[in-house]
Amino acid sequence: CKAMHVAQPAVVLASSRGIASFVCEYASPGKATEVRVTVLRQADSQVTEVCAATYMMGNELTFLDDSICTGTSSGNQVNLTIQGLRAMDTGLYICKVELMYPPPYYLGIGNGTQIYVIDPEPCPDSDF
């Protein structure tokens, strides 16, 4: 197993609709054809998997149907979108990239993107 550099933004603020997007960029040392991208969340001294997708270079990223993540790939960049976020989901979201094929296997882990989620205030009652 070999190490690989992964870059991602330090901070992202989710939209009022609970959607956060960020770019995960990896420095591919070779010509990988199969790449696995995993989003991890670190909070309260625990790391949990948020979503994961394996894709062939040049093809679209495909997450499971019930995943809260969507994404697109372009070269060595993956554009990730996480939806359905609430204030309690605030945390450090880490991009993990694995070059699965061909060998050798490479593993890269980003420094994490701190995603802040603020629940919208309920609209006050209106006479109109």
Partner: nanobody, 126 residues
Amino acid sequence: QVQLVESGGGLVQPGGSLRLSCEASGGTLDYWSIGWFRQAPGKEREEVSCISGTGLRTNYADSVKGRFTVSRDNSRNSVILQMNSLKPEDTGVYYCTGKLLHPSLWSACANEYDLWGQGTQVTVSS
């Protein structure tokens, strides 16, 4: 709240083997840096081994190199210390320690640890 629990200690003859396990209750050890320490009677506590959060890096004290092997068993949410060719001087209480570092340090062992288990006794004697 995560707690660390060691198991696998016991009495073994010189040259024998033991397999210590460090498991987490109340959480997981995924991406945690895990260290193994030991304390022999009347001696200072010493670190014998550690494994990084990714599992790609392992370190060993000179006194156990080539005899001890640390590994992660993610399917069982545990870290294993395989001890072979045991010597009487390996006798002591073995402690599992852990710390979840920032992701930028997941490929490294921790310099200090937040959590300590209760320890498991290892006695090497004929």
